[in-house]
């Protein structure tokens, strides 16, 4: 059954002082002529129960649509079972597999068992009760105080294990498996274990900050990246493999940083600024990715203005130094007492003494 609950009834006591039936006869045959009491035998009392839908005016007939049951013989004329509560003999349990409707009509009848196959059983007393009852562990006590016999009984409706609500139609069974990770509160609501969410607590709560768009998890606190994404929170795209000076907004892109070009952003668009290749005050111009051109000042040539043309024309060697042109520019051979690239340093100033012999010569680019 999809739903689980039961209506329980427990007989508590019976008082049938004279041992009579509803029709006025004795349970055990004839009356004593003197005091009119039934003396031959006590009643063999048992109970029948009929549970049906709520009726404002109770009719004895019709089906017991919510269930019916009976006890075995549980006593004689008068008995009290309050001390032996929980004894199954005086309890009738009517299970049902529908949502408990809360309102009901209950018919309870006390009968005398004839212990005789020929003689039928006879009714001692009947009680009817219409009302409303919510599922609870607590019992509700009811009394039948009119007529031949008086009896007392208690009723309750209990939900089966894992069923909750006024109708016992809400199911919640704790679990820790593929289908969920939860306990159940007193109302049958699922309470997720830490790290899980969703109506069935089977959706893991990912690492705080994990991208909801590009990250996911099967285990609480984890963050697994979609293809093309990376990082602790799966919020960084993976650029095109081999991308050097580039980034991405979407996976596999290679968006070049300033001054870089080419498919892999590995081509320098500002070769002049990065490498400063032009020598001797040459002017550099970027002409294309990884390409440049040097404009050399007068007297210099070569791709990087590294070649000095007729460097001695400008008389760069001072103090009577003699100039000699070289592939890299010129070289000064200084007269005695002078040194430096252009023979402009006095050796007396530099060393504090006057040397003898030839001067020093230096290369100049």
């Amino acid at each position: 059954a999809d739903l689980g609950s039961q209506f329980e009834l427990e007989i508590l006591s019976m008082q049938n002082v004279n041992g009579e039936l509803q029709n006025g006869n004795c349970c055990g045959g004839v009356r004593n002529p003197g005091d009119r009491k039934c003396t031959r035998d006590e009643c063999d009392t048992y109970f029948k129960v009929c549970l049906k839908e709520y009726q404002s005016r109770v009719t004895a007939g019709g089906p017991c649509s919510f269930g019916s049951g009976s006890t075995p013989v549980i006593g004689g004329n008068t008995f009290n079972l309050k001390a032996s509560r929980g004894n199954d003999r005086n309890r009738i349990v009517l299970p049902f597999s529908f949502a408990w409707p809360r309102s009901y009509t209950l018919l309870v009848e006390a009968w005398d068992s004839s212990n005789d196959t020929i003689q039928p059983d006879s009714i001692i007393e009947k009680a009817s009760h219409s009302g409303m009852i919510n599922p609870s562990r607590q019992w509700q006590t009811l009394k039948q105080n009119t007529g031949i016999a008086h009896f007392e009984y208690q009723i309750r409706v209990t939900c089966d294990d894992h069923y909750y609500g006024f109708g016992c139609n809400k199911f919640c069974r704790p679990r820790d498996d593929f289908f969920g990770h939860y306990a159940c509160d007193q109302n049958g609501n699922k309470t997720c274990m830490e790290g899980w969410m969703g109506p069935d607590c089977n959706k893991a709560i990912c690492r705080q900050g994990c991208s909801p768009k590009h990250g996911s998890c099967k285990l609480p606190g984890d963050c697994r990246c979609q293809y093309g994404w990376q990082g602790l929170y799966c919020d960084k795209c993976i650029p095109h493999p081999g991308c050097v000076h580039g980034t991405c907004n979407e996976p596999w892109q290679c968006l070049c940083e300033t001054n870089w070009g080419g498919q892999l952003c590995d081509k320098d668009l500002n070769y002049c600024g990065t490498h400063q290749p032009c020598l001797n005050r040459g002017t550099c111009s970027n002409t294309g990715p990884d390409k440049y051109q040097c404009s050399c000042p007068e007297g210099y040539s070569g791709p990087n203005c590294e070649i000095a043309e007729h460097a001695c024309l400008s008389d760069p060697c001072h103090n009577r130094g003699s100039c000699k042109e070289t592939s890299s520019g010129f070289e000064c051979e200084c007269s005695p007492g002078w040194t430096g690239p252009t023979c402009s340093t006095n050796i007396d100033d530099e060393f504090g003494l006057v040397p003898r012999g030839s001067g020093h010569h230096h290369h100049h680019h």
């Epitope: 704790p174 820790d176 593929f178 306990a183 159940c184 309470t191 274990m193 830490e194 899980w196």
Partner: antibody, heavy 116, light 107 residues
Amino acid sequence: EVQLVESGGGLVQPGGSLRLSCAASGFTFSNYGIHWVRQAPGKGLEWVGWITPDGGYTDYADSVKGRFTISADTSKNTAYLQMNSLRAEDTAVYYCARAGSWFAYWGQGTLVTVSS
Amino acid sequence: DIQMTQSPSSLSASVGDRVTITCRASQDVSTAVAWYQQKPGKAPKLLIYSASFLYSGVPSRFSGSGSGTDFTLTISSLQPEDFATYYCQQSYTTPPTFGQGTKVEIK
């Protein structure tokens, strides 16, 4: 750091009782359940039972049903395994493991020997 | 209860070998399978969860695959520290059940 520490194991006679403890730290105990898993010497792993975070529900393996009881004291961050009517086949290392994330976190285990 | 059957029960392999362990469930368990490694005297350690997800801190030489009833644990290049017993476990429904284990020994 999540930590589970079992204690209470030892030698007990058949028919006897023993109570194991599982002390938890490094996480909010009342937000997770606890499972008990055992391993007989030289054998595989066998699930024993579990308790929900609030301690309101327990479930057991058929082999221990009616003999073992799992409980928890959230004020002490501790789960318990009460073992009654012990049999020789209950001899094993008993582990507790945190619920809610497969069995990612285990204790070091405590050995229970049932022998006369 | 769902039965988990592991094979082989033991195997011998050398460092650097590729090792494959299989696990078969007695009924469909979707991807609700985990793999554990256990060394003598120690508690089991989670390696793989949800059939194919590598648990945090586990070396990438371990991988898992499968769904439904057939599952596989693969160690791509066996290392000295990988000699241990491996267990599969289903967490599809209660009670959770384990395979009988596969002992990986040095050849």
